[in-house]
């Protein structure tokens, strides 16, 4: 392992998974590294092997239990270390005392569906996946709609500042194909970030009735 510029970032999905990314410029692709988790008040230790995801980036998931089990709480601290093999010994490359509920990134919302579609509007609902009951209603969402001829990056963001698992899109164009995505973020945690975007949901508005203004 070479001493290039390195970065170690981990997030807790609020239930039973800690996902980590380790990046290091100049590191050899075949360097063997792992993440070791040592909780302060639990009986388990966990290790996962860092696997390459790009030229200088490795990732792994610490799976702490069944997907919907609540394995950590707001008072837990898990010491996370990146260990890389150097000859016959392991070297600590990064260490952090990880507070799970300060470093949240939830799973992407799932089960997107069109509840009702008209010529100019569409009502869409979704569900959150593997989210802790601790949040109660303290979640927010961002949504975006892909219009024809545009990119996702150009799509304006719609913010839902409460736990609302539906949206009514308005001022749509009749008989037009759209795509919709949503992501979620807990309000808690200094280093908490948005979930990945959901899988896009494709829908088409109804055509305008013949002889009527649009």
């Amino acid at each position: 392992a070479v001493n290039g510029t390195s970065q170690f970032t981990c997030f807790y999905n609020s239930r039973a998974n800690i996902s980590c990314v380790w990046s290091q410029d100049g590191a050899l692709q075949d360097t063997s590294c792992q993440v070791h988790a040592w909780p302060d008040r639990r009986r388990w230790n966990q290790t996962c092997e860092l696997l390459p995801v790009s030229q200088a980036s490795w990732a792994c998931n610490l799976i702490l239990g069944a997907p919907d089990s609540q394995k950590l709480t707001t008072v837990d601290i898990v010491t996370l270390r990146v260990l890389c093999r150097e000859g016959v010994r392991w070297r600590v490359m990064a260490i952090q005392d990880f507070k799970p509920f300060e470093n949240l990134r939830l799973m992407a919302p799932i089960s997107l569906q069109v509840v009702h579609v008209e010529t100019h509007r569409c009502n869409i609902s979704w569900e959150i996946s593997q989210a802790s009951h601790y949040f109660e209603r303290h979640l927010e969402f961002e949504a975006r709609t892909l219009s024809p001829g545009h990119t996702w990056e150009e799509a304006p963001l719609l913010t839902l500042k409460q736990k609302q698992e539906w949206i009514c899109l308005e001022t749509l164009t009749p008989d037009t194909q759209y795509e919709f995505q949503v992501r979620v973020k807990p309000l808690q945690g200094e280093f908490t970030t948005w979930s990945p975007w959901s899988q896009p949901l494709a829908f088409r508005t109804k055509p305008a009735a013949l002889g009527k203004d649009t």
């Epitope: 001493n3 170690f8 970032t9 040592w38 070297r91 490359m93 990064a94 260490i95 952090q96 005392d97």
Partner: nanobody, 126 residues
Framework: QVQLVESGGGLVQPGGSLRLSCAAS????????MSWVRQAPGKGLEWVSS????????YYADSVKGRFTISRDNDKNTLYLQMNSLKPEDTAVYYC???????????????????RGQGIQVTVSS
């Protein structure tokens, strides 16, 4: 804004002890790795010791290993450096420093230092 205020320095004889303190404010203290660095007269900044956010990982420069102990009290937002068996070469201005995240990188101990205090003078002389 981040504030780090060191105290506890002074003049001490070789072989003596001092305990430095650093009162932190303006950020969530327990979320960040912290360190002590020092600057001897006419020299550059030298890393001394680091500690992770909950104090579960501690690291030391070879020059102070076995003599200095870093610790923290997250309830009091305070970082400490207990210095024993002091030597004349420990004479320096000591700075309390905050890293830019909760992560500390042992191979590059000074990397990521984002803020530091005004410093406190420690003089070891007979």
């Amino acid at each position: 804004q981040v504030q780090l205020v060191e105290s506890g320095g002074g003049l001490v004889q070789p072989g003596g002890s001092l305990r430095l303190s650093c009162a932190a404010s303006g950020f969530t203290f327990s979320n960040y790795a912290m360190s002590w660095v020092r600057q001897a007269p006419g020299k550059g900044l030298e890393w001394v010791s680091s500690i992770t956010g909950a104090g579960r990982g501690t690291y030391y420069a070879d020059s102070v290993k076995g003599r200095f102990t870093i610790s923290r009290d997250n309830d009091k937002n305070t970082l400490y450096l207990q210095m024993n068996s002091l030597k004349p070469e420990d004479t320096a201005v000591y700075y309390c420093a905050k890293y830019d995240s909760s992560t500390y990188y042992p191979p590059t101990p000074a990397r990521g230092i984002a803020d530091r205090g005004q410093g406190i003078q420690v003089t070891v002389s007979s």
